[in-house]
Interface confidence: medium
């Protein structure tokens, strides 16, 4: 058993049939010594008396809010949550496995630049009685500070018969050094509580590996005289790190016909313009990637050829 | 060329070679098989790699003030990785694929380090970890980790030389 926060305790249980469970001793937070009784949740049934209560926690029915009273007055509460371990593996029932970039990916994180700011998100099908708390640091043995906000519901989607809820959180490294080569990964820890079930999820990454620039901005076409060619130009996204002579991007320019089956023409360039042939009913798209480190490409910015 | 205590490197040449190093490091990486590094125990060889840290003056401001600190750090790293790529970890079994770019990568690391430090000038270089051959089983993981680490190192070096070529070239 360990304390998650004040008056909230997590009991770690091996979850198999006929498991003996964990013996837990609760102590009433009061100077009083006698006349103390204990109840669980809303029930008025007295579970025991005295300053301490010893219980055998085996299942969710044994978890919940234990309250000690004296003469009708509440003295203190202890909320017991369960953390299940089945076949040596901690349960992951609350969050959905996003399966990208590999199986057992529950948390996904992205950064728009090297400033030390990043966003993480996760998915669940649970809509009520759900709380999250997020902690983060750089490194684990001698952790350096990363400050995370509160997790918020950022999207709802319908997937077949189910509703899926996306939560996200923004974090900022306290003393970020954008130009340095990271040697210690960022660690993100999410505590999830659904009713009386506790689970924790972790992710470990370097900012450089989760970089995904915003799409290029101000995408424009300029027809070239007496030619089917056009000059496409664009600019670095506002959110990208500066100076651009140091934090450089590379770009992919694509000409795509109306039909998905049509052959795509692609050009790669380090410049912020390119000359391409504009076909009728086609569109021109540009995306960006860090020039020197192969992290994710941005989403496409597009304009129609006409 | 970067001479200790003084003159500027050939920024444009360094930029071109460091960008080539980035390309080679990324084309070499898939050849060692995909493994999740953080699920594996850390090996000494990759714990000791020289990183370009915050105080090394490799940020735009630091380069403007005095690029020598940063160039010395990059030089140290290039020599370190050049030694690792020439070590038994890469030259031993299991054999790399026939068209592996590791040989080219090794030669380019040497080329860039020589651009930064011509013959006859000696910057202190970091102690190379023991190059005694590990078992072939362990080599694959080490190759993977070293190349992942090298990708990060050469990305910072390439940024330094790109910025230098754009803003510090005579």
């Amino acid at each position: 058993i360990w304390e998650l926060k004040k008056d909230v305790y997590v009991v770690e249980l091996d979850w198999y049939p006929d498991a003996p469970g964990e013996m837990v001793v609760l102590t009433c937070d009061t100077p009083e010594e006698d006349g103390i009784t204990w109840t669980l949740d809303q029930s008025s049934e007295v579970l025991g008396s005295g300053k301490t209560l010893t219980i055998q926690v085996k299942e969710f029915g044994d978890a919940g809010q234990y309250t000690c009273h004296k003469g009708g007055e509440v003295l203190s509460h202890s909320l017991l949550l369960l953390h299940k371990k089945e076949d040596g593996i901690w349960s992951t029932d609350i969050l959905k496995d996003q399966k990208e970039p590999k199986n057992k990916t529950f948390l996904r994180c992205e950064a728009k630049n090297y400033s030390g700011r990043f966003t993480c998100w996760w998915l669940t099908t649970i809509s009520t009685d759900l709380t999250f708390s997020v902690k983060s640091s750089r490194g684990s043995s001698d952790p350096q500070g990363v400050t995370c906000g509160a997790a918020t519901l950022s999207a709802e989607r319908v997937r077949g018969d189910n509703k899926e809820y996306e939560y996200s959180v923004e974090c900022q490294e306290d003393s970020a050094c954008p130009a340095a080569e990271e040697s210690l990964p960022i660690e993100v820890m999410v505590d999830a509580v659904h009713k009386l079930k506790y689970e924790n999820y972790t992710s470990s990454f370097f900012i450089r590996d989760i970089i995904k620039p915003d799409p290029p901005k101000n995408l424009q076409l300029k027809p070239l005289k007496n030619s089917r060619q056009v000059e496409v130009s664009w600019e670095y996204p506002d959110t990208w790190s500066t100076p651009h002579s140091y934090f450089s991007l590379t770009f992919c320019v694509q000409v795509q016909g109306k039909s998905k089956r049509e052959k795509k023409d692609r050009v790669f360039t380090d410049k912020t313009s390119a000359t391409v042939i504009c076909r009728k009913n086609a569109s021109i798209s540009v995306r960006a990637q860090d020039r020197y480190y192969s992290s994710s490409w941005s989403e496409w910015a597009s304009v129609p050829c006409s | 060329r970067a001479v200790p205590g003084g003159s500027s490197p050939a920024w444009t040449q360094c930029q071109q070679l460091s960008q080539k190093l980035c390309t080679l490091a990324w084309s070499a990486h898939p050849l060692v098989g995909h493994m999740d590094l953080r699920e594996e125990g850390d090996e000494e060889t990759t714990n000791d790699v020289p990183h370009i840290q915050c105080g090394d003056g490799c940020d735009p401001q630091g380069l403007r003030d005095n690029s020598q600190f940063c160039l010395q750090r990059i030089h140290q790293g290039l020599i370190f990785y050049e030694k690792l790529l020439g070590s038994d970890i890469f030259t031993g079994e299991p054999s790399l694929l026939p068209d592996s770019p590791v040989g080219q990568l090794h030669a380019s690391l040497l080329g860039l380090s020589q651009l930064l430090q011509p013959e006859g000038h000696h910057w202190e270089t970091q102690q190379i970890p023991s190059l005694s051959p590990s078992q072939p089983w362990q080599r694959l993981l080490l190759r993977f980790k070293i190349l992942r680490s090298l990708q990060a190192f050469v990305a910072v070096a390439a940024r330094v030389f790109a910025h230098g070529a754009a803003t510090l070239s005579p």
């Epitope: - | 060692v32 098989g33 995909h34 493994m35 020439g86 070590s87 038994d88 030259t91 031993g92 079994e93 299991p94 054999s95 590791v102 040989g103 090794h106 190059l131 005694s132 051959p133 078992q135 072939p136 089983w137 694959l140 993981l141």
Partner: antibody, heavy 114, light 112 residues
């Protein structure tokens, strides 16, 4: 074209030493380790050791420890295997083989006889 | 050391018929990258060994497709779908997963 060309046959007395050379061509000599393998008449192949031509670091089969020394001369793109304190059971064909074992020398017969 | 046990010692085959050679290692040669570090060689009379198969099942350059390798972490098989006269010689398996690299005792393939 990758080629490994070994020195000629040798006849040695028990207790003597022999040094076999292996000249490599057609590839960058320092990019690949060089293995040495031997085969006694009618016996299975036996790996003796390996050298990294960049640094001269070696790993030997414990069976030969103390008797075998593998060296290289990178300027001549040549690897050497020296076996000392020869005994009659060291009579064998000795091969050099490049890392990957796709390329082998033609073999050098060493006969140990009094 | 990893011990490589090869069977049979001798294999008489009729040309055009298939042939199969087995090799067993005393320790798994399957690494966590999913690759199995086992080689097969053919040594023709009076010649150096030639690499046939590496990584348990990958044919070396120039090796005819009648040769194939398969197996698990410790049990391996070299198959020749239709034996030809030029296939005679001694076949060896070898592990390169761990030092010292070790070879099987060899299987002599001869034409009936």
């Amino acid at each position: 074209e990758v080629q490994l060309v070994q020195s000629g046959a040798e006849v040695k007395k028990p207790g003597a030493s022999v040094k076999v050379s292996c000249k490599a061509s057609g590839y960058s000599f320092t990019d690949h380790n060089m293995n040495w393998v031997r085969q006694a008449p009618g016996q299975r192949l036996e790996w003796m050791g390996v050298i990294n031509p960049n640094y001269g670091t070696t790993t030997y089969n414990q069976k030969f420890k103390g008797r075998v020394t593998i060296t290289v001369d990178t300027s001549a793109s040549t690897a050497y295997m020296e076996l000392s304190s020869l005994r009659s059971e060291d009579t064998a064909v000795y091969y050099c083989a490049r890392r990957g074992f796709a390329y082998w020398g033609q073999g050098t017969l060493v006969t140990v006889s009094s | 050391d990893i011990v490589m046990t090869q069977t049979p010692l001798s294999l008489p085959v009729t040309p055009g018929e298939p042939a199969s050679i087995s090799c067993r290692s005393s320790k798994s040669l399957l690494y966590k990258d999913g690759k199995t570090y086992l080689n097969w060689y053919l040594q023709k009379p009076g010649q150096s060994p030639q690499l046939l198969i590496y990584l348990m099942s990958t044919r070396a350059s120039g090796v005819p497709d009648r040769f194939s390798g398969s197996g698990s972490g410790t049990d391996f098989t070299l198959k020749i779908s239709r034996v030809e006269a030029e296939d005679v010689g001694v076949y060896y398996c070898q592990q390169i997963a761990e030092y010292p690299f070790t070879f099987g005792s060899g299987t002599k393939l001869e034409i009936k």
